[in-house]
């Protein structure tokens, strides 16, 4: 079954899918599709990487971490409700049927409409709970609802893991991760 | 320590090619994608190609496919770049360089000395 | 190809003042930019990959920040022998493509 993703229309989703190169530079080619993982390849592919780069992409897909270490977690900018459905990373590892194939699901939700404020109200009330992290881009903020499902009693935990590191990295074990060697 | 020295400079006259070696030392040549950039006088850097040494593959930009060949010699660790139908325009000093991450994913990035390719008539 | 895009293409600042440049990818790149400085009759030196990792025996007064499309280049307090001209270079999809350079100089 899936893992689910979730963001909010305007926002940009992330769906994390690693692996680790045997060894440095030994990179492996991945793709990622719109639609479940077929038998071969990936139908409708929206981004692809070969042993040296990025080498096909669409408008709005592209990778923010580091895919020469064997980041290869997708972003996808500005998402719509027509985004939502299942994704397939597919890490292309050499010989027959050695792939390593992950469906991952994105749900978007509508943007929250925020009635205009008024005197007295509280201000959190009236905006989405935002974990920043660094090393995302300018200004970049993933809400809440981005994350896979989590509980809120493990938000303050969360929050203080995500203050120094990579959101990519704190949430690798909610994600695609594959071993290559 | 990693060196790369590259051959010595050259004329040629238009229409001409010319072939431009860089030889490396230092670290495990057959593991990291040879570059060849460009950097015509008073210009900005331009990227030609790489090659790859353990397997002789090959990426070359677009604007150079038609008259760049890369070639590697792994018994010297000698990289080649040939550039045929040689034009003024492609006066410049020729740089051959190597990056990307080495053990430990450490960032490696060394460059040859260049090598003023002039094509006067 | 992705273009970059960088400014200023030059500018004049006094030792020790905040030099500042930026780097715009017609597409986004994620981390993949790297800075190099040239000085007159040398060879490009790396500072800076990955956006903000600084190259081996690099001053620390150099660093690099941005992720995606934008991308900014800082020596914190200039250097006389910081005077040279600068490229960002992106690594994301071949071919590998520079900057036109920002030369810097001291007033």
């Known amino acids: 079954s899936e893992v689910e993703y979730r963001a909010e229309v305007g926002q940009n989703a992330y769906l994390p899918c690693f692996y680790t190169p045997a060894a440095p530079g030994n990179l492996v080619p991945v793709c990622w599709g719109k639609g479940a993982c077929p038998v071969f390849e990936c139908g409708n592919v929206v981004l692809r990487t070969d042993e040296r780069d990025v080498n096909y992409w669409t408008s709005r897909y592209w990778l923010n971490g580091d895919f020469r270490k064997g980041d290869v977690s997708l972003t996808i900018e500005n998402v719509t409700l027509a985004d939502s459905g299942i994704y397939c990373c597919r890490i292309q590892i050499p010989g027959i049927m050695n792939d390593e194939k992950f469906n991952l699901k994105l749900v978007i939700k509508p943007a929250k409409v925020t009635p205009a404020p008024t005197r007295q109200r509280d201000f959190t009330a009236a905006f989405p709970r935002m974990l920043t992290t660094r090393g995302h881009g300018p200004a970049e903020t993933q809400t809440l609802g981005s994350l896979p499902d989590i509980n809120l009693t493990q938000i303050s935990t969360l929050a203080n893991e995500l203050r120094d590191s990579r959101l990519a990295n704190d949430l690798r074990d909610s994600g695609a991760t594959i071993r290559i060697g | 320590q990693v060196q790369l020295v590259q051959s010595g400079a050259e004329v040629k006259k238009p229409g001409a090619s010319v072939k431009v070696s860089c030889k490396a030392s230092?670290?495990?040549?057959?593991?990291?994608?040879m570059n060849w950039v460009r950097q015509a006088p008073g210009q900005g850097l331009e990227w030609i190609g790489d090659?790859?040494?353990?397997?002789?593959?090959?990426k070359y930009n677009q604007k150079f496919k038609d008259r760049v060949t890369m070639t590697t010699d792994t018994s010297t660790s000698t990289a080649y770049m040939e550039l045929r139908s040689l034009r003024s325009d492609d006066t410049a000093v020729y740089y051959c360089?190597?990056?990307?991450?080495?053990?430990?994913?450490?960032?490696?990035?060394?460059w040859g000395q260049g090598t003023l390719v002039t094509v006067s008539s | 190809d992705i273009q970059m895009t960088q400014s200023p293409s030059s500018l004049s600042a006094s030792v020790g003042d905040r030099v500042t440049i930026t780097c715009l990818a017609s597409?986004?790149?994620?981390?993949?930019l790297a800075w190099y400085q040239q000085k007159p009759g040398k060879s490009p030196k790396l500072l800076i990959y990955?956006?903000?990792s600084l190259a081996d025996g690099v001053p620390s007064r150099f660093s690099g920040s941005g992720s995606g499309t934008d991308f900014t280049f800082t020596i914190s307090s200039l250097q006389p022998e910081d005077i040279a001209t600068y490229y960002c270079?992106?690594?994301?999809?071949?071919?590998?493509?520079f900057g036109g350079g920002t030369k810097v100089e001291i007033k």
């Open positions: 360089a190597t990056w990307g991450y080495g053990s430990s994913y450490r960032w490696f990035d060394y």
């Open positions: 090659i790859i040494p353990n397997n002789g593959g090959s």
């Open positions: 270079q992106q690594l994301y999809s071949s071919p590998w493509t």
């Open positions: 597409q986004p790149i994620g981390i993949w």
């Open positions: 230092g670290y495990t040549f057959t593991d990291y994608y």
């Open positions: 990955a956006a903000t």
